[in-house]
Interface confidence: low
């Protein structure tokens, strides 16, 4: 049940987002979320997760990359990238001369 809060051991994570109350937080796991909204540069948020574990299994897209880990400050130095979008001229196996 993904909407139940985790009751497992807590881990300390780096917290860098508008919702942070301090430099670290405690949760069931650590998160790094890279989001690109329409017409804006991608923004990376670091924090703690307690709900919706299923998000951790999502594959990166051109709009979001959701990373999870479960050890002390494991999200501190993680850098994410978004799935690159290919224009027809950039597709594999094509020559653009």
């Amino acid at each position: 049940d993904p909407v139940k809060p985790s009751r497992g051991p807590l881990v300390t994570c780096t917290c860098e987002s508008p919702h942070c109350r301090g430099p670290t937080c405690q949760g069931a796991w650590c998160t790094v979320v890279l989001v690109r909204e329409e017409g804006r540069h991608p923004q990376e948020h670091r924090g703690c997760g307690n709900l919706h574990r299923e998000l951790c299994r999502g594959r990166p897209t051109e709009f979001v990359n959701h990373y999870c880990c479960d050890s002390h400050l494991c999200n501190r130095n993680v850098s994410l990238v978004l799935e690159a979008t290919q224009t027809p001229s950039e597709q594999p196996g094509t020559d653009s001369q």
Partner: antibody, heavy 122, light 108 residues
């Protein structure tokens, strides 16, 4: 390469307390969770519980009232105590590591101890 | 609590493909891990996170997970693959580990 080496008493009487210890070689305590799993003779695997680097624990509800898992970071060891044992607790007991990193959320056991057969008999 | 169901036994001839199933209610979104256990030995992780292999595990071992069934596939089965196989998940509703009952793979 992580190695787990475990030891403890192999023969107990009913109502006694099972006590096992697992030493960790070549691995960092802080990046993993440390687990105990048991296997009764001829049967399947049963997870007992886990402890993390800070000493926080998480136990199988069916055993929770009798189980204590603790760790000694100075010795890179963690221990299992199971109180009030009965014949139903006769099993091979394994210690195991759960790395909890990357995209794996929750436990997966990548390194195991050699196993200790614990027999409970009067 | 969450339950994983495995067939007690699977038999296959050498060189053929063995498929061992692990059933669970809506198991698809969960990460499924598989272990091989030979008599008198500790289990060995052979597939994790549905389909990834730890280093040292042959490519003959693969996994898939969808709907209500996860499957461990062993291609070109060898006599040395004869063992018990267990599936395992993390039950995120209560943060506990769940194992399947195990499947004995017999190589004919």
């Amino acid at each position: 390469q992580v190695q787990l080496q475990q030891w403890g008493a192999g023969l107990l009487k009913p109502s006694e307390t099972l006590s096992l210890t697992c030493a960790v070689y070549g691995g960092s305590f802080s990046s993993s969770y440390w687990n105990w799993i048991r296997q009764p003779p001829g049967k399947g695997l049963e997870w007992i519980g886990e402890v993390n680097h800070s000493g926080s624990t998480n136990y199988n509800p069916s055993l929770k009232s009798r189980v204590t898992i603790s760790l000694d970071t100075s010795k890179n060891q963690f221990s299992l105590k199971l109180s009030s044992v009965t014949a139903a607790d006769t099993a091979v007991y394994y210690c195991a590591r759960s790395p909890r990193s990357g995209r794996i959320v929750g436990a997966v056991f990548d390194y195991w101890g050699q196993g200790t057969l614990v027999t409970v008999s009067s | 609590s969450y339950v994983l169901t495995q067939p007690p036994s699977v038999s296959v001839a050498p060189g053929q493909t063995a498929r061992i199933t692990c059933g669970g209610n809506n198991i698809g979104p969960k990460s499924v891990h598989w272990y091989q256990q030979k008599p008198g030995q500790a289990p060995v992780l052979v597939v994790y996170d549905d389909s990834d292999r730890p280093s040292g595990i042959p490519e003959r071992f693969s996994g898939s997970n969808s709907g209500n069934t996860a499957t461990l596939t062993i291609s070109r089965v060898e006599a040395g693959d004869e063992a018990d196989y267990y599936c395992q998940v993390w039950d995120s509703s209560n943060d506990h580990v769940v194992f399947g009952g195990g499947t004995k793979l017999t190589v004919l």
